[in-house]
């Protein structure tokens, strides 16, 4: 591109015409202030293409850069653009006149910014002040640009002298901004509500000073639109937030939420949803399976735990055998109810130590001005076995017998063995299982007893050896679900003298 | 300051030429921009063609292959040879001259086309 006169800067006078030619090898054209003024295109005979940009009248106004540009860069090897700056002395013109958003002047970091005030003659003297201040701060001045530096956040007005009088510019405002990658959180008061409470969304963006809110919602779909608020934590730096506040929700709001923040200064933005589910009533479900019959061991501490949803909050109540329970002084019964989420609750029923008389009939109730939900099982309390008796007799039959007796929760198995060999056995031989009734050796008589105020069943059972021709240990073996206990007797013949 | 004077118009047929001249007064010592403009009733001052310092001859499209821009550097004078001219070259001519960042116009001369 070739530029006449060449430049970089010319001065010329008010009310005077100038021409600007550029001329190059494909189209060209004239820019002023991102636009195209009024030129005329010519070409010479070499294929030589000019643009001819002829100023007149001339006044302070015409004072600033020019630029010359092929009309069409697409397609040439550089996007060349040739600048002239020219300046019209005008009297009657003081500081050129900014566009508004040329007067605040934001700063995402510390950085040289230019506060751009500039005169028609650069032969004045510019000086910048603080809005507020005389003094003038040392910061180099350049007539085409203005004044650069690094600023704080203050506002600042340039003044310079015309003639005999002092003139000042526009105030300009420089901000520094808090700007960061865009981090959203969304959350409701609730995001169960019933028809006609309110629904009460939150939005909240941290580490930007300015950002666009924009919330999608079921309503605005159908055109009816909600103004959603705007404020900044005051106790929390760069947090603000945009409360959206449907009151007396209908069942159309049920729905997906979303706030989608814009920062415009690098061009970020996330968006976060949440989902608000509108009930035409509260409700109260059980959640999970809990069986009729429960158990517990004796003297173990524990837990029974029933899960379920429900909005609004519900009461719980827990009862035994139909009467009330509560927690107790002595530290034997603890309730609980927990929200686990926002509509989910675990209620905990711990018996400490459990006893006896804890068996029995349980009942859960969770309810509400809206629905209720009841649960129920047995709580059956398991006890060890314990062998209480073993005991041998030779009644005058002529036979041997031994008796053992024992009692557990749930129903103890008895298990008769016997050892022959008492050196060998049990550690060499295993034990030989009696009362099969294949064997007519022994005979087994088993009798089952329900004890109800203990709670627990007992086992008596006899075992009629036929005839023992030498010393027998004999082994009873009580188990239920939670244990075993076993004692031994060892039977000699009649004939011996002696037993052990 | 340089004074230029610009002849040569009048009354011309459709097809027919015309020869403008532009004498300028005083002493030029380089000359940045030459030109002729013109403006039609009711219409802005357009350039017809022009010759930058060291350049070849510009014209618009509307004038190319009719008109010729020349110069005698020994009598201060350009001329602007106007040939099968139309009725819408009708206008007031000017020539103009810069040099450095002054410039000076012609008073214009009228060209009319018409039969």
């Known amino acids: 591109l070739v530029v006449t006169p060449p430049g970089p800067e010319l001065v010329l006078n008010v009310s005077s015409t100038f021409v600007l030619t550029c001329s190059g090898s494909a189209p060209v054209v004239w820019e002023r202030m991102s636009q195209e003024p009024p030129q005329e295109m010519a070409k010479a005979q070499d294929g030589t293409f000019s643009s001819v940009l002829t100023l007149t009248n001339l006044t302070g106004l015409d004072t600033g850069e020019y630029f010359c540009t092929h009309n069409d860069s697409r397609g040439l090897e550089t996007d060349e653009r040739k600048r002239l700056y020219i300046f019209v002395p005008d009297p009657t013109v003081g500081f050129l006149p900014n566009d508004a958003e040329e007067l605040f002047i934001f700063l995402t970091e510390i950085t040289e910014i230019t506060i751009p005030c500039r005169v028609t003659d650069p032969q004045l003297v510019v000086t910048l002040h603080e809005k507020k201040g005389d003094v003038a701060l040392p910061v180099p001045y350049d007539h085409q640009r203005g004044f650069s530096g690094i600023f704080e956040d203050r506002s600042y007005i340039c003044k310079t002298t015309i003639g005999d009088r002092e003139v000042d510019s526009d105030a300009y405002y420089v901000y520094r901004l808090q700007v960061s990658s865009i981090n959203v959180s969304v959350n409701a008061v609730q995001t169960v509500v019933r028809q006609g409470e309110n629904i009460t969304l939150m939005c909240i963006v941290i580490g930007n000073e300015v950002v666009n809110f924009e919330w999608t919602y079921p309503r605005k779909e159908s055109g009816r639109l909600v103004e959603p608020v705007t404020d900044f934590l005051l106790d929390m730096p760069y947090h603000i937030r945009s409360i959206l506040h449907i009151p007396s929700a209908e069942l159309e709001d049920s729905g997906t939420y979303t706030c989608n923040v814009t920062e415009s200064v690098n061009d970020h933005q996330d968006e976060k949803a949440i989902n608000i589910t509108v009930v035409e009533s509260g409700y109260v479900r059980l959640l999970g399976e809990v069986g009729t019959l429960q158990f517990a061991e004796l003297h173990r501490s524990r837990t029974l735990q029933v899960v379920f949803e429900a909005y609004p909050p519900p009461t719980v109540l827990w009862f035994k055998d139909n009467r009330t329970l509560g927690d107790s002084s002595a530290g034997e019964i603890a309730l609980s109810t927990r929200n686990v989420s926002e509509t989910r609750y675990v209620s905990e029923l711990t018996l400490v130590r459990v006893k006896v008389a804890e068996a029995g009939h349980y009942t859960m109730r969770a309810f509400h001005e809206d629905a209720e939900v009841q649960l129920s099982f047995q709580l059956q309390i398991n006890v060890p076995v314990r062998v209480l008796e073993l005991s041998e007799s030779h009644p005058d039959s002529g036979e041997q017998t031994v008796r053992c007796r024992g009692r557990g929760m749930p129903q103890p198995n008895i298990i008769w063995s016997a050892c022959r060999d008492l050196k060998r056995c049990p550690r060499e031989l295993p034990p030989t299982l009696l009362g099969n009734s294949s064997e007519e050796e022994s005979q087994l008589e088993t009798n089952v007893t329900y004890w109800e105020e203990e709670q627990e069943f007992e086992v008596v059972s006899t075992l009629r050896l036929q005839h023992v021709d030498r010393p027998l240990s004999v082994r009873c073996t009580l188990r239920n679900a939670v244990g075993q206990d076993t004692q031994e007797v060892i039977v000699v013949p009649h004939s011996l003298p002696f037993k052990v | 300051e340089v004074q230029l004077v610009e002849s040569g118009g009048g009354l011309v047929q459709p097809g027919g030429s015309l020869r403008l001249s532009c004498a300028a007064s005083g002493s030029i010592v380089r000359v940045d921009f030459m030109g002729w403009y013109r403006q039609a009733p009711g219409k802005q001052r357009e350039v017809v063609t022009f010759?930058?310092?060291?350049?070849?001859?510009n014209y618009v499209d509307s004038v190319t292959g009719r008109f010729t821009i020349s110069r005698d550097n020994a009598k201060n004078t350009m001329y602007l040879q106007m040939n099968s001219l139309k009725p819408e070259d009708t206008a007031v001519y000017y020539c103009y001259i810069q040099s450095g960042t002054a410039g000076s116009w012609g008073q214009g001369t009228q060209v009319t086309v018409s039969s």
């Open positions: 010759i930058t310092s060291g350049g070849s001859p």
